[in-house]
Interface confidence: medium
């Protein structure tokens, strides 16, 4: 049994880091493998993660961590029974993938403005809480070419757009994702999408 693709890990910079790797053949990850992780810190204890299958030869492990700080560094060992298959390290602050925003809501009752709001996925005491910026994706269910991205570079988790920038009388969907420039993170996963019917009053023509 050998590791084909070494583990790569990303952290949500809160409580979970996710490591993925590939073996050289079909593997029952949960029965055959264990991923050991230990914070390089005074008197820290090692922890065991039981991986799950992620495709035939792929494995994924969700490492539970206490509140992460930028200096944290973990040793990682991948074991198959008594055999050490791979040894490495992981610094969560250098491999951050933020949590996806939640509770995306489209408010259509604000005159002819669409107000999209969502929730910051971090609690106020987490460093990322005040460092997230967002991308909002809006698309038409009827017209694949009607697909747009709005970058929200301010901290408030909301976006206002004129309803008239979208076509009237058809259904749209929206979703949002986050990233943090401070840690040069990757983008989060997209939030679940939300759907609404876009309708607005055409302005009277002026003669």
């Amino acid at each position: 049994m050998k590791v084909l693709q070494e583990p790569t890990c990303v952290s949500d910079y809160m409580s979970i880091s996710t490591c993925e790797w590939k073996m050289n053949g079909p593997t029952n990850c949960s029965t055959e493998l264990r991923l050991l992780y230990q914070l390089v810190f005074l008197l820290s204890e090692a922890h065991t993660c039981i991986p799950e299958n992620n495709g035939g030869a792929g494995c994924v492990c969700h490492l539970l961590m206490d509140d992460v700080v930028s200096a944290d560094n973990y040793t990682l060992d991948l074991w198959a029974g008594q055999q050490l298959l791979w040894k490495g390290s992981f610094k969560p602050s250098e491999h951050v993938k933020p949590r996806a925003p939640g509770n995306l809501t489209v408010h259509t009752n604000v005159s002819d403005t669409l107000l999209l709001t969502w929730s910051n996925p971090y609690p106020p005491d987490n460093y990322l809480y005040n460092h997230l910026t967002y991308a909002v994706n809006i698309w038409s269910e009827n017209d694949p070419a009607d697909f747009r991205i709005y970058n929200v570079t301010y901290l408030e988790p909301s976006l206002r757009i004129a309803a008239s920038t979208l076509k009237s009388g058809i259904s749209y969907r929206a979703r949002v994702r986050a990233w943090a420039q401070c840690y040069n993170t990757t983008w989060s996963e997209w939030s679940p999408s939300t759907k609404w019917h876009n309708s607005y009053r055409e302005p009277f023509e002026q003669h």
Partner: antibody, heavy 117, light 107 residues
């Protein structure tokens, strides 16, 4: 060269107190956790106190908790162990040791503590 | 607490011998194990960490092996200066604990 030199050992009666010191040199003292490890007359090793580099965190095994206090003076590069309510089973050779997270990478030569009436 | 058992408290060896010192833990350590050498009248010295990683300055005749609960310190060709007591220490669970030691004596 890393050097750790203990002092302060001696003969003390049960229930008595003693304060050990350890002078450190050859490394950036404040960057390392430090510890006291004792060796019993039967030659068994047991750590009895650990302190973080900044001195803000301390750790003790149940056998000495509430009786021993570890401290450090980073300005003087010195580690201390205040021992009180001493018992005969505390009789040992006490080593000052530098801690590399989980194991002890440098040790002093030790100072002897004898608890006897 | 994790119990660390060094089955031989002492044994006699000859110079040039291949010496194997064993250490057994009461639970799986996943290689979180260190070995120390203590010469008579001296402080312990760290030889090996992570069950197999030799510390800087330690002669290459020393090596560590093992996994799970069973670990071994090997001296391939015993020298006079290797006469000492050897201790294992686990750092899998706090409180970290030491084995009782194995003393090498020359026949």
């Amino acid at each position: 060269e890393v050097m750790l030199v203990e002092s302060g050992g001696g003969l003390v009666k049960p229930g008595g107190s003693l304060k050990l010191s350890c002078a450190a040199s050859g490394f950036t003292f404040s960057s390392y956790a430090m510890s006291w490890v004792r060796q019993t007359p039967e030659k068994r090793l047991e750590w009895v106190a650990i302190i973080s580099g900044g001195g803000d965190s301390t750790y003790y095994p149940d056998s000495v908790k509430g009786r021993f206090t570890i401290s450090r003076d980073n300005a003087k590069n010195t580690l201390y162990l205040q021992m009180s309510s001493l018992r005969s089973e505390d009789t040992a050779l006490y080593f000052c040791a530098r801690l590399h997270y989980w194991y002890f990478d440098f040790w002093g030569t030790g100072t002897t503590v004898t608890v006897s009436s | 607490d994790i119990q660390m058992t060094q089955s031989s408290s002492s044994f006699s060896v000859s110079l040039g011998d291949r010496v194997t010192i064993t250490c057994k833990a009461s639970e799986d350590l996943y290689n979180r194990l260190a070995w120390y050498q203590q010469k008579p009248g001296n402080a312990p010295r760290l030889l090996i960490s992570g069950a197999t990683s030799l510390e800087t300055g330690v002669p290459s005749r020393f090596s560590g092996s093992g996994s799970g609960r069973d670990y071994t310190l090997i001296i391939t060709s015993l020298q006079t200066e290797d006469v000492a007591t050897y201790y294992c220490q686990q750092y899998w669970r706090n409180p970290y604990t030491f084995g009782g030691g194995t003393k090498l004596e020359i026949k």
